[in-house]
């Protein structure tokens, strides 16, 4: 069944003498593998023999391949799907029909392919877009219906015979659908390319010319113009005449309208290729150009800068910046319309010429208050000297100058006085608006720049004021030199360093922190009694009787100050010990007797020891010794010993007499 055979391949293949042809081909024989293949040139069916006649270019049978034309023709296919063929080299007489006779076990098929071989290499074909506009990128395509693996070729682009520097992209196709070689060139044409010849040249692998195709570029573009002016330098004086001419050097398509522009604005009623300006004024200075339009758009000429020269106009001064801060830099700029530009300037400060200042700008690197005032200038060019304008005012601002703090009081100032101070200054710009005082205190400011200190403190040493506008300027501090009575008077023990024991040498110092004036006197007092007039109070050998409350006084011409009372404590061992007996030194047996150890000690006695007449210690350590019930045998002399941290003291003997009770006497 012939419908079982399906072939795909290009319908016609093109080549030229000496080149090669590569025929991509696929097939499908549904009833089995290919058993026999014959490639015919111009086959014709012979009805008598029921076979095809014609030149056999290639033959392949079950018995094996039959060598044919010395391998010029090659079957590159297989037994079931590939039927690709190659003829290399290909000859002119290969043109015509190629017949692929295919036989499987049960079926046969003849597939026909057209081969067109020319005598010489045929030219490629250039494809252009329908319209080309200047500066718009286009793609030029060069197509050749040829490609063969055994015959490499190249396509080259030329503009007016010169290779184009833009990079072209070459692609090839050798598929069952199409066989071709294509070169694509991306290109942004300029108006100058209009009418130029573009060539696509076919070359062999060595660059040898084979064939070509050419096209003429039709580049649509706006009109290209040239402007001419008389006089040629376009420099005139007021009252002169000027002529400008507009020439079209190229336009595609043809131009339609003409107009003239000055400084980008269209000039009314000027629609010819010549512009005549009579008796020009300085206002006619500017940039002129002509504009010509076509269907693509308007084209403009280069600009001609017409300069109408005139003497400088009255000048104005611009100040960078006013008001200026003292110490900052300031720049003055003289502004005067003139053509040509002024070559010389004269500067004035408060109407007086500033020597050596001839430039357009005056720069003062460090502004001082005296630089304030009116600045004006005069500009000069070759046509004359301008007039002096109104000038500009420079305001120089600075902190208050020569600020001083002044004490209004008579001197000396005493602690507790009311002190008035004023804050004075020499000059200020802008005006002083407020004052500050150091140190800060809860003080009155009865008027601007005046400070009143009620009840001035002894430690108010110095006061400084500041006068403030946008800045504060501080005066040097002024010393109040407040006089006051001695302060922080206190009694200090110099020796001994530790606690005072009876018999120690003791020195007390009367200290004070400060006094103004410095000359002072000292007084020592105990219980209202004057003891001495030195800064120190000395005891060669302290006794317990010296203990008590001491004060010292320090006075100067302002007043006197007493210390806090200072307690002098003298430590001593127990003394003046004695044993007292209760209810008395004679007690009846069976009753209770209490012995008490009395003493004087500092610190107090911590414990006591009791002894009998044989100096035997009794197991008691408290101040009282209670004997209950008392016995006659307890009669005898008792004594006690007191102990503190300083030492011990003992009492003399005290005799206790215990007498018999009437009951005991009665029993005897």
């Amino acid at each position: 069944d012939s419908s079982k055979w399906v072939f795909e391949h290009p319908e016609t293949l093109y080549a030229w003498e000496g080149a090669c042809v590569w025929i991509p081909c696929t097939y499908r024989a549904l009833d089995g593998d290919l058993e026999s293949f014959i490639l015919f040139h111009n086959p014709e069916y012979n009805k008598n023999t029921s076979k095809f006649d014609g030149t056999r270019l290639y033959e392949s049978t079950k018995d094996g391949k039959v060598p044919s034309e010395q391998k010029r023709v090659q079957f590159l296919g297989d037994k079931n799907k590939n039927c690709t063929l190659s003829i290399h080299p290909v000859h002119l007489n290969d043109s015509g029909q190629l017949g692929l006779r295919m036989e499987s076990k049960t079926e046969k098929w003849m597939e026909r392919i057209h081969l067109n071989v020319s005598e010489r290499p045929f030219p490629p074909h250039i494809q252009l877009p329908p319209e080309i506009q200047e500066s718009q990128e286009v793609t030029l395509t060069c197509l050749l219906n040829f490609s063969c693996y055994g015959y490499p070729i190249q396509l080259q682009w030329l503009l007016e015979g010169v290779p184009m520097r833009q990079a072209a992209v070459t692609s090839t196709s050798l598929t069952i659908k199409s066989v071709f070689t294509r070169s694509e060139l991306k290109f942004s044409p300029q108006w100058s390319h209009h009418g130029k010849i573009v060539t696509c040249q076919l070359q062999d692998a060595d660059g040898k010319f084979l064939s070509n195709d050419t096209v003429q570029l039709n580049v649509k573009h706006t009109p290209k113009l040239e402007i001419k002016v008389t006089p040629s330098d376009a420099i005139v004086r007021e009252g002169d005449s000027v002529t400008m001419t507009c020439e079209v050097s190229s336009s595609n398509p043809e131009y339609t309208t003409v107009s003239w522009l000055k400084d980008g604005t269209s000039l009314k009623k000027q629609n010819t290729f010549t512009l005549n300006l009579r008796e020009v004024t300085k206002d006619q200075s500017g940039k002129y150009c002509c504009q010509v339009s076509n269907d693509v758009g308007p084209g403009r000429s280069e600009e001609v800068f017409l300069q109408v020269q005139y003497a400088p106009e009255p000048s104005t001064v611009q100040i960078l910046h006013s008001p200026a801060v003292e110490g900052s830099q300031v720049e003055f700029l003289c502004m005067s319309l003139a053509n040509p530009l002024p070559t010389n300037y004269t500067w004035y400060h408060n109407g007086k010429e500033m020597q050596g200042r001839t430039e357009e700008k005056v720069h003062i690197p460090k502004i001082l208050p005296w630089h304030a005032g009116t600045y004006s200038c005069v500009a000069e060019n070759i046509l004359g000297t301008g007039q002096r304008g109104p000038g500009a005012e420079l305001d120089v601002q600075y902190p208050p100058k020569k600020v001083t703090t002044v004490i209004q009081n008579p001197m000396p100032i005493r602690e507790g006085d009311t002190v008035t101070l004023s804050c004075n200054y020499n000059s200020s710009n802008p005006s002083v608006t407020r004052y500050e005082w150091k140190p800060h205190g809860a003080w009155e400011e009865p008027s601007l720049g005046v400070l009143k200190i009620q009840n001035v403190g002894w430690d108010n040493t110095t006061i400084a004021c500041a006068a403030c506008n946008s800045w504060c300027s501080w005066a040097s501090p002024v010393a109040l030199n407040v006089q006051y009575a001695p302060r922080d008077v206190r009694v200090r023990k110099i020796k001994p360093l530790s606690e005072i024991h009876s018999g120690n040498s003791v020195s007390l110092q009367c200290d004070f922190s400060s006094s103004h004036p410095k000359e002072v006197q000292f007084f020592w007092e105990k219980n209202g009694r004057l003891l001495g007039k030195e800064s120190q109070l000395n005891f060669d050998s302290i006794s317990p009787e010296d203990a008590g409350s001491y004060s010292c006084w320090v006075n100067n011409s302002i007043g006197q100050t007493a210390s806090k009372a200072w307690t002098l404590e003298v430590l001593y061992a127990p003394r003046r010990l004695r044993v007292s007996m209760s209810p008395g030194d004679q007690v009846m047996e069976g009753k209770s007797a209490t012995l008490t150890c009395e003493s004087d000690a500092n610190p107090p006695v911590s414990h006591y020891t009791w002894f009998d007449w044989n100096n035997q210690s009794l197991p008691y350590h408290s101040q009282k010794l209670r004997l209950e019930p008392v016995k006659v045998q307890h009669s005898g002399a008792y004594w006690c010993q007191g102990t503190n941290s300083v030492g011990k003291g003992r009492s003399p003997l005290s005799t206790l007499t215990v007498y018999y009770s009437p009951e005991t006497i009665g029993r005897r």
Partner: antibody, heavy 118, light 107 residues
Framework: QVQLQQSGPGLVKPSQTLSLTCAIS??????????WNWIRQSPSRGLEWLGR?????????DYAVSVKSRITINPDTSKNQFSLQLSSVTPEDTAVYYC?????????WGQGTLVTVS | DIVMTQTPSSLSASVGDRVTITCRAS??????LNWYQQKPGKAPKLLIY???SLQSGVPSRFSGSGSGTDFTLTISSLQPEDFATYYC?????????FGQGTRLEIK
């Protein structure tokens, strides 16, 4: 080595007299550096000092105020012992009774006698 | 009478712990304060006399301090045999008085 050995009944009837003896070995009741004490201990009262006897140049006694009217502590030099007598006892007097020597603190104690008043 | 107050009344601690017991007298007793240890069924045992003196035969981990009215017994590192009741006692004046005791238990 000082030892104190207590003796006396463990049960006393209310209103009767509690009598305990403490025999001393290793020291003398007449020592002029020691004091001889009676102390009792009960859950309700804790450790309670009752009194002491000691000899210096004579014999002395000290008693706790709480028992002063009912207590007697006597030395017996011949037997080198000292005794406690507590009269008119009540169940409140139920306790463990200890004798102890005091030189610098109670350094030697008797073994203790549990006396129950019932 | 001089009243002796011990704190705390009971205390739980572990072997190796450092333990402090305080005793306060109602009036100054100088250094006439003694410390005792008592185990159940036994008589008290003197540990410290005169506030800080260690009684002969008592381990050195026991120490005492203080004078006047405030006193302290310290056991530097508790041993298993130290769990007992501790008493302070003043011998400054008669009547001789004891603290109410501090019971030291194993935690």
């Amino acid at each position: 080595q000082v030892q104190l050995q207590q003796s006396g009944p463990g049960l006393v009837k209310p209103s009767q007299t509690l009598s305990l003896t403490c025999a001393i070995s290793g020291d003398s009741v007449s020592s002029n550096s020691a004091a001889w004490n009676w102390i009792r201990q009960s859950p309700s009262r804790g450790l309670e000092w009752l009194g002491r006897t000691y000899y210096r140049s004579a014999w002395y006694n000290d008693y706790a105020v709480s028992v002063k009217s009912r207590i007697t502590i006597n030395p017996d030099t011949s037997k080198n012992q000292f005794s406690l007598q507590l009269s008119s006892v009540t169940p409140e007097d139920t306790a463990v009774y200890y004798c102890a020597r005091d030189v610098e603190g109670f350094d030697y104690w008797g073994q203790g006698t549990l006396v129950t008043v019932s | 009478d001089i009243v002796m107050t011990q704190t705390p009344s009971s205390l739980s601690a572990s072997v190796g712990d450092r333990v402090t017991i305080t005793c306060r007298a109602s009036q100054s007793i100088s250094s006439y304060l003694n410390w005792y240890q008592q185990k159940p069924g036994k008589a008290p045992k003197l540990l410290i006399y005169a506030a800080s003196s260690l009684q002969s035969g008592v381990p050195s981990r026991f120490s005492g301090s203080g004078s006047g009215t405030d006193f302290t017994l310290t056991i530097s590192s508790l041993q298993p045999e130290d769990f007992a009741t501790y008493y302070c006692q003043q011998s400054y004046s008669t009547p001789i008085t004891f603290g109410q005791g501090t019971r030291l238990e194993i935690k």
